[in-house]
C-alpha cells in the first residue's frame, strides 16, 4: 500500500499525535486471523488472559474482537488508511474492560484490564494492506508491528520496506 | 467528498410496500468502516431511527419497526435500500439516508448508532 | 429505551448572544454515547458533536458540548446569523437509539 519511506514519514509524528476525540467513531465486532488463517484466541487462565494463535478445529467458534476506530490529528497517507483525511487508530478489545497493549520492553503484546482514557499502549495504527490484509503499528514505538513469533503474538519491527508486506504482520478481520 | 442521495416513488398506497434506495458516491460502501442506516421524519416532528447495516449484510433494526423492516446492501452499486410493508399513514414522512458510526454496548452485546453524513431527504406520502 | 427530553422547547436569542441547551436522559449511561445534530428548515440535519464533546468535521469551535451520566448540554458560545435552527440530541448508547424532541432556537 505504501514504501517504507513513507512509512516512515508517516509514523515520524505518531508519538506526539493526539486522538481527536475521546469517543470512538465507530465500532467493528470481527474475529482476528493471521495471514495464513490461524485463529487469535484468548483464554482466561489464573485470572489473567492469554492470547495464543491456533489452527481451529472446523466448526469451532472464532473468538471475537471489538475493534474501536478512533480519528487522529494528523493527516493520513496517501493510501487510504484514514477518514476525512486523518489517520486512524484502532483498539482491540476481546472482552469487556480488556484491551490488547503494547509492551515495548518485552516486544510483547498483552491483555490489561484497565478504565478509559486508555493509555497509549491500547493504541495502534491501522494499515490497510494488500488482499483485505491490515496491520497494527504501536502508537508508542513506530516501525514496530503486532506481529506473529511462535504461535504468540508479539512486536515486530519493521525496517525495510520488504519486511512491510512480510506475512507475520498481516492480519484479517472477519464477521464469522 | 462522500454524498448520499435517496430515491424512490413519493406517494405509496396503504397496505402496500414503501421501497427506497440510497446510492453513495465519493467513497466506497464496501471498504468503508461506517455503517449505513435509514432514519424517518414526520411532518413537523422528530427524528425516528428505522435500522442500519454494515457492507457485510447485517442488520440492525429498530424494534418498534422490526417486523415490516428489511435493509439491503449492493456493494456492486454501492447502493443500499429500505423496504417497509404494510405502510400506514403514519409512515408519511421525510426519510433521510445516512452513514452511521456503530458503537457496541457489552451489557446487553448490541450495537447502537449515530448518523455523521445525511442524505437530502425524499418525502414519502401514504394515501389512497 | 431511554427517553431523552430536550428544554427549553424553544430559545429567543439575539445573534452574539450565547445559548444553552440542555438534554436529559432517562437513564444514567456511562459511556457518554450521545449526539447533537443541527437541523434548518427543509434541510437534513447535520451532525454537530458525537460522544458528548468530539466536533464533528468541519463544524466551528463556537459549538462545544459536555455532560455525562444523565445531564448533556449544547453550549453556543457567539449565535451567528447561521446558527438559528432547531437542534436535536441523541444517545446510541444503547439499542434502540433515540433522538429528544428538539430545541428551537429563534431570532428574538
Known amino acids: 500500500a505504501f514504501g517504507i519511506s513513507g512509512v516512515q514519514k508517516y509514523t515520524r509524528a505518531l508519538h506526539d499525535s493526539s486522538i481527536t476525540g475521546i469517543s470512538p467513531i465507530t465500532e467493528y465486532l470481527a474475529s482476528l486471523s493471521t495471514y495464513n488463517d490461524q485463529s487469535i484466541t484468548f483464554a482466561l487462565e489464573d485470572e489473567s488472559y492469554e492470547i495464543y494463535v491456533e489452527d481451529l478445529k472446523k466448526d469451532e467458534k472464532k473468538d471475537k474482537v471489538l475493534l474501536s476506530y478512533y480519528e487522529s490529528q494528523h493527516p493520513s497517507n496517501e493510501s487510504g488508511d484514514g477518514v476525512d483525511g486523518k489517520m486512524l487508530m484502532v483498539t482491540l478489545s476481546p472482552t469487556k474492560d480488556f484491551w490488547l497493549h503494547a509492551n515495548n520492553k518485552e516486544h510483547s503484546v498483552e491483555l490489561h484490564k484497565c478504565e478509559k482514557p486508555l493509555p497509549d499502549q491500547a493504541f495502534f495504527v491501522l494499515h490497510n494492506m494488500h488482499s483485505n490484509c491490515v496491520s497494527f503499528e504501536c502508537k508508542t514505538d513506530p516501525g514496530v508491528f503486532i506481529g506473529v513469533k511462535d504461535n504468540h503474538l508479539a512486536l515486530i519491527k519493521v525496517d525495510s520496506s520488504e519486511n512491510l508486506c512480510t506475512e507475520n504482520i498481516l492480519f484479517k478481520l472477519s464477521e464469522t | 467528498q462522500l454524498q448520499l442521495q435517496e430515491s424512490g416513488p413519493g406517494l405509496v398506497k396503504p397496505s402496500e410496500t414503501l421501497s427506497l434506495t440510497c446510492t453513495v458516491s465519493g467513497g466506497s460502501i464496501r471498504s468503508s468502516i461506517f455503517y449505513w442506516g435509514w432514519i424517518r421524519q414526520p411532518p413537523g416532528k422528530g427524528l425516528e431511527w428505522i435500522g442500519s447495516i454494515y457492507y457485510s449484510g447485517r442488520t440492525y433494526y429498530n424494534p418498534s419497526l422490526k417486523s415490516r423492516v428489511t435493509i439491503s446492501v449492493d456493494t456492486s452499486k454501492n447502493q443500499f435500500s429500505l423496504m417497509l410493508t404494510s405502510v400506514t399513514a403514519a409512515d408519511t414522512a421525510v426519510y433521510y439516508c445516512?452513514?452511521?458510526?456503530?458503537?457496541?454496548?457489552?451489557?446487553?452485546?448490541?450495537?447502537?448508532?449515530?448518523?455523521?453524513?445525511w442524505g437530502n431527504g425524499t418525502t414519502v406520502t401514504v394515501s389512497s | 429505551e431511554i427517553v431523552l427530553t430536550q428544554s427549553p422547547g424553544t430559545l429567543s436569542l439575539s445573534p452574539g448572544e450565547r445559548a444553552t441547551l440542555s438534554c436529559r436522559a432517562s437513564q444514567s449511561f456511562s459511556s457518554s454515547y450521545l449526539a447533537w445534530y443541527q437541523q434548518k428548515p427543509g434541510q437534513a440535519p447535520r451532525l454537530l458533536i458525537y460522544?458528548?464533546?468530539s466536533r464533528a468535521t468541519g463544524i466551528p469551535d463556537r459549538f462545544s458540548g459536555s455532560g455525562s451520566g444523565t445531564d448533556f448540554t449544547l453550549t453556543i458560545s457567539r449565535l451567528e446569523p447561521e446558527d438559528f435552527a432547531v437542534y436535536y440530541c441523541?444517545?446510541?448508547?444503547?439499542?434502540?437509539?433515540?433522538f429528544g424532541g428538539g430545541t428551537k432556537v429563534e431570532i428574538k
Open positions: 445516512a452513514r452511521a458510526g456503530g458503537l457496541y454496548n457489552w451489557n446487553d452485546e448490541s450495537f447502537s448508532f449515530y448518523m455523521d453524513v
Open positions: 460522544g458528548a464533546s
Open positions: 441523541q444517545q446510541y448508547d444503547r439499542s434502540p437509539l433515540t
